[in-house]
């Protein structure tokens, strides 16, 4: 089920979505759409990036983070109750059925009459308990990748065995998006 995020009417909503580029500048296209992720692409696209830049956006929807480093979290400005619903972040890794799909749910609430004390932003790990985090070899080189529901330890082991096929090894090496397991 979708992870739920809340925002008050009139405030900005933050919907997180991340991936790890294989190397700085090695970006993959990303789309954000209103509604759950369809089989391919995004429905009702509100924002889209290509391999270089944000190439489509609509008013009130923008990327606040550094999308060149894989932070493609969506900010929705000045939300209304009508903004409630499911949003799709789709990381469009080239290849057949290769996309990473993340459905997140935005709940817009009416502001409380008494303004509460400011609270910390929701803990990311709690929000995405199934995120796969891998540590590289250098200090402070923790990478957070998009949720990969189709990969488990058994499959990683199986994939490692299949890497003996040199053609697959070469293709994976050159594919432009990597997962390092260290």
């Amino acid at each position: 089920s979708e992870v739920e995020y809340r925002a008050e009417v009139g405030q900005n909503a933050y919907l997180p979505c991340f991936y790890t580029p294989a190397a700085p500048g090695n970006l993959v296209p990303v789309c954000w759409g209103k509604g759950a992720c369809p089989v391919f692409e995004c429905g009702n696209v509100v924002l889209r990036t290509d391999e270089r830049d944000v190439n489509y956006w609509t008013s009130r929807y923008w990327l606040n983070g550094d999308f060149r480093k894989g932070d493609v979290s969506l900010t929705i400005e000045n939300v209304t109750l009508a903004d409630s619903g499911i949003y799709c972040c789709r990381i469009q890794i080239p290849g057949i059925m290769n996309d990473e799909k993340h459905n997140v749910k935005l709940v817009v609430i009416k502001p409380a009459k008494v303004t509460p004390a400011p609270t910390r932003q929701r803990d990311f790990t709690a929000a995405f308990p199934r995120m796969l985090t891998t540590r590289g070899h250098g200090p402070a080189e923790t990478q957070t990748l998009g949720s990969l529901p189709d990969i488990n330890l058994t499959q990683i082991s199986t994939l490692a065995n299949e890497l003996r096929d040199s053609r697959l090894a070469n293709d994976l090496r050159d594919s432009g998006a990597t997962i390092r397991i260290g």
């Epitope: 970006l27 391999e51 290849g95 057949i96 529901p149 189709d150 488990n152 293709d171």
Partner: antibody, heavy 118, light 113 residues
Framework: QVQLQQSGGGLVQPGGSLRLSCAAS????????MSWVRQAPGKGLEWVSG????????YNADSVKGRFTISRDNSKNTLFLQMNSLRAEDTAVYYC???????????WGQGTLVTVSS | EIVMTQSPDSLAVSLGERATINCKSS????????????LAWYQQKPGQPPKLLIY???TRESGVPNRFSGSGSGTDFTLTISSLQAEDVAVYYC?????????FGQGTKVEIK
């Protein structure tokens, strides 16, 4: 060597159902995404359905959405396509195909003819 | 989805002569991060399943004769048979695997003149 042996085609009336099977040998089915591709008589190739290595994600062409279901039994190294509510325009030779590294189709089954006619 | 268009629909070439098939995609299938074009070519003989000939635009599959070559980038691609042999009579398809559903060209039938 890699082999994909198909079965289950035949003649069916409109609205009927069929289940196609594709038995894989020579490789570990669970390590690869798989697809079904069809070819109407005298026509070109059309991708129909696909499934991830684990079976956790499935994909269907709009033309078969809600009617066809792709599945796999990795323990039996077999891929399936359940076809319901068949229409005349579904008449085609259906091929199962192995997807290499989420890129291209490197091995194909021999094909099985599905004819939808009253 | 990406639409693939081949030309010509058919061509007749004399034995030993060059055959050239063109394929155009409705949007680029070049991924700039790895400089690869996500395009493959298949050969289909009558009564047989398609056979992978070329992937990544120009890489021949194992066992494919070197008279088959692929070229192009972005949206325009070419399959060339440098010296047509009798066993090359077939329908040839291009296919993109860059994004969305994998899509094929409509096919080009190669015959002997």
């Amino acid at each position: 060597q890699v082999q994909l042996q198909q079965s289950g085609g035949g003649l069916v009336q409109p609205g009927g159902s069929l289940r196609l099977s594709c038995a894989a040998s020579g490789f570990t089915l669970s390590s690869y995404a798989m697809s079904w591709v069809r070819q109407a008589p005298g026509k070109g190739l059309e991708w129909v359905s696909g499934i991830s290595g684990s079976g956790g994600s499935t994909y269907n062409a709009d033309s078969v959405k809600g009617r066809f279901t792709i599945s796999r039994d990795n323990s039996k190294n077999t891929l399936f396509l359940q076809m319901n509510s068949l229409r005349a325009e579904d008449t085609a030779v259906y091929y199962c195909a192995k997807i290499f590294g989420s890129y291209y189709f490197d091995y194909w089954g021999q094909g099985t003819l599905v004819t939808v006619s009253s | 989805e990406i639409v693939m268009t081949q030309s010509p629909d058919s061509l007749a070439v004399s034995l030993g002569e060059r055959a050239t098939i063109n394929c155009k995609s409705s949007q680029s299938v070049l991924y700039s991060s790895n400089n690869k074009n996500y395009l493959a070519w298949y050969q289909q003989k009558p009564g047989q399943p398609p056979k992978l000939l070329i992937y990544w635009t120009s890489t021949r599959e194992s066992g494919v004769p070197n008279r088959f070559s692929g070229s192009g980038s972005g949206t325009d691609f070419t399959l060339t048979i440098s010296s047509l042999q009798a066993e090359d009579v077939a329908v040839y398809y291009c296919q993109q695997y860059y994004s969305g559903p994998p899509t094929f060209g409509q096919g080009t039938k190669v015959e002997i003149k």
